[in-house]
Structures are given as C-alpha cells and as structure tokens.
C-alpha cells in the first residue's frame, strides 16, 4: 500500500516580521526519508530546492533556507513541499513574511515568532498540479 505523505510545516526564525537588512531563515519540516525540500514563493513559478536535509528527530527531517539580508521584495507568502522518493508531498500552509523599516535592529522585541500554526499562516490552495521529480533536475528561478 502506498504511503500517505504528511503535509510539511513551515516556520520562520527569528520570526515573520523582519527588519529591513536583517536575516531570516525559513524552516521546512517533513517526515524521515525526505530527499529534497522546496521553498515556494507566492506561486510555484519561483522556488528554491535543497538536498541539505537534516534529521530533526527520529521521525522528522528538516531543511533551512536562509536570507542573509532581507529586502522589501522578500515580503510575501512562502510555503514548503518535499520529495520523498518516489513522490512529492502536498504543500504546507502559507506563511507570510512581513518586512518593516529597521527601527530596533534585528533583535527588536516586536519580531513575531514564526510558527506553522501562527497568525501569519494562510491555508494553501488545494490545486494538485504535478511537480517535477527531483531526478529531472528542474531549474529554479531562485528566490534570493
């Protein structure tokens, strides 16, 4: 019987409201055995893939996507999917990244923690377009 792949989760560190010029890391999580995580921006046409997967726990894997210096253009909706051979998962919920004018620096107290269930989360659409398998080496229009 074919495995049902759980939906991935997405979160952001240190949060989802980031001062201009500060860094943010998107964290995608899925089950063990994930080979590729993909971070999608707004739509599927813009994404970044990584095979730099780590084992977050005996039952969970994760990948981290870092933006070193956030620009206004980085604001928007992000979501994750993953490839666990031989299938791609569904998308995670959307997470919205907000970029604000720098006032209190990167450790400003009003930086909201990013969470897969947080207030900036939006449900993903339910479309199920085919994703290219990782083995096809599809080129990404990079996010950053």
């Amino acid at each position: 019987q074919e495995e049902d792949l759980p939906r991935p989760s997405i979160s952001a560190e240190p949060g989802t409201v980031i001062p201009l010029g500060s860094h943010v890391t998107f964290v995608c999580r899925g089950p063990v055995g994930v080979q590729t995580f993909r971070l999608e921006r707004d739509s599927r046409s813009t994404y970044n893939d990584t095979e730099d997967v780590s084992q977050a726990s005996p039952s969970e894997s994760e990948a981290r996507f870092r933006i070193d210096s956030v620009r206004e253009g980085n604001a928007g909706l992000y979501r994750c999917i993953y490839y666990k051979p031989p299938k791609w998962s569904e998308q995670s919920d959307y997470l919205e990244l907000l970029v604000k004018e720098s006032s209190g620096g990167p450790d400003s107290p009003d930086t909201e923690p990013g969470s897969s269930a947080g207030p900036t989360q939006r449900p993903s659409d339910n479309s199920h377009n085919e994703h290219a398998p990782a083995s096809q080496g599809l080129k990404a229009e990079h996010l950053y």
Epitope: Q1, E2, E3, P31, V32, G33, Q35, T36, T50, E51, D52, V53, S54, Q55, P58, S61, K84, P85, P86, K87
Partner: antibody
Framework: EQSLEESGGDLVKPEGSLTLTCTAS?????????ICWVRQTPGKGLEWIGC????????TYYASWAKGRFTISKTSSTTVTLQMTSLTAADTATYFC?????????????WGPGTLVTISS | ELVLTQTPASVSAAVGGTLTIKCQAS??????LAWYQQKPGQPPKLLIY???YLASGVSSRFKGSRSGTEFTLTISDLDCDDAATYYC????FGNGHTFGGGTEVVVK
C-alpha cells in the same frame, strides 16, 4: 528477525540470460521500501544496478549502464527479481539485494549474503 | 553521471590511532551520502547515513562529516576489527546510487 536472501546464481554461457530472486523474511515488500540490486566483481568494488519501490507505484530506478539489459520486478509480497540478458564475462560478480528504508534516508541498512553469477563458455 | 572519488585507495594505521577517508562527489548531492564497511565474504554493513548520522548499533568511533561536495569518514581509536574496505555511496535519486571506489584499511 528481518533478512534478505538472493538465489538463482549460476554458471551461464555468454549472451545467455539469468533471473535472480531476492526473498524477504520477517517483513513484507508491501511496505514502502526501495529494494535495490548491487553487484561486486571478484576483488573489485561495489556497483549499483538499480532499485524498485515496493509500494503500489512500483517505480523503478536504474544505473544508466543497466537500462535495457537489466529489469527489476516485484513478483510477490516477499520476492523481487533481477532479470539479466545478453550476459558477458564482465557481468561475472556476486549479486546482492539490499533494502533502502526511509528512517536511514534510503541508504541500505539490510543486505542479503549475495549470490554468485559466473559467465563463461 | 555522478562520480564519487574515494581517497586514499588503501591506508595502514596503528591500533588506537585515527584515520580519515574522503569521498568527493562530482555533483551536488546535499547530505544524501552513506558510508559502509565490508569484510571479505560478507555483504556491506551500513555505518553512516545522511552524511553524518550513525546507523543503529554502530560504534561512536565512526564519524561522518560533510563540506559541500566533500564527505569524510573518520575512525578514531582504531581497533583490529576495523580492518575492512570502506565505501561511500550517494543515496540521491536524481544522480544515481553510485558507490565510491572503496578504501582498504589495514590495522597494524
């Protein structure tokens, strides 16, 4: 205890064909594993042949050199076969089947002891 | 086609010492790399998966690490039982589950 065992190794003439069988004990190929074949020529290194997904999709995945001449099939809930055609002396090797599991990120945590295939006239 | 270049092809080290085996991938495979130990007449035994994670039941004297496309297996406090041939393997489905050429380890 979970184990794999290969069978079917034999002495075959050049240009001949042979089918090897990998049999599972203590678990079923109905679970979501990749069952893979690897060979080792005498005194040489390991050479990956290909894999089949034991889930219902039955996806297969081959080394480029093996496509067309080697075919991996799931024949029952406990057996996977490797069909080999147009065999030459270069195919003389010990053939292993191995299991790739998600919890070891598709590396091969379980191997059979191997079966010897000799191609000679 | 992915090539994994393992170095050295053979190495000799003393009991109690430390040795390092390297595996260079010709393409990006991320962390999708495993290390195996094989002794004569036996199938390979999984040591390390996902570049740096120790397989169940394997001694913590074995350590895997990665820097870009270069992977390293380090064996510390060498034991006579560590004499074997060691192989790296890509577990990346896009590039093929290729094996490195192997490193024969002799323990003196």
């Amino acid at each position: 205890e979970q184990s794999l065992e290969e069978s079917g190794g034999d002495l075959v003439k050049p240009e001949g064909s042979l089918t090897l069988t990998c049999t599972a004990s203590g678990f079923s190929f109905n679970s979501n594993y990749w069952i893979c074949w690897v060979r080792q020529t005498p005194g040489k290194g390991l050479e990956w042949i290909g894999c089949i997904y034991s889930g219902s999709s039955g996806d297969t995945y081959y080394a480029s050199w093996a496509k067309g001449r080697f075919t991996i099939s799931k024949t029952s809930s406990t057996t996977v076969t490797l069909q080999m055609t147009s065999l030459t002396a270069a195919d003389t090797a010990t053939y292993f089947c191995a299991r790739g599991a998600d919890y070891v990120y598709w590396s091969y945590g379980l191997w059979g002891p191997g079966t010897l295939v000799t191609i000679s006239s | 086609e992915l090539v994994l270049t393992q170095t050295p092809a053979s190495v000799s080290a003393a009991v109690g010492g430390t040795l390092t085996i390297k595996c260079q991938a010709s393409e990006t495979i991320g962390t999708n790399l495993a290390w195996y130990q094989q002794k004569p007449g036996q199938p390979p035994k999984l040591l390390i998966y996902l570049a740096s994670y120790l397989a169940s039941g394997v001694s913590s004297r074995f350590k895997g690490s990665r820097s870009g496309t270069e992977f390293t297996l380090t064996i510390s406090d060498l034991d006579c039982d560590d004499a074997a041939t060691y192989y790296c393997q890509s577990t990346h489905f896009g590039n093929g589950h290729t094996f490195g050429g192997g490193t024969e380890v002799v323990v003196k």
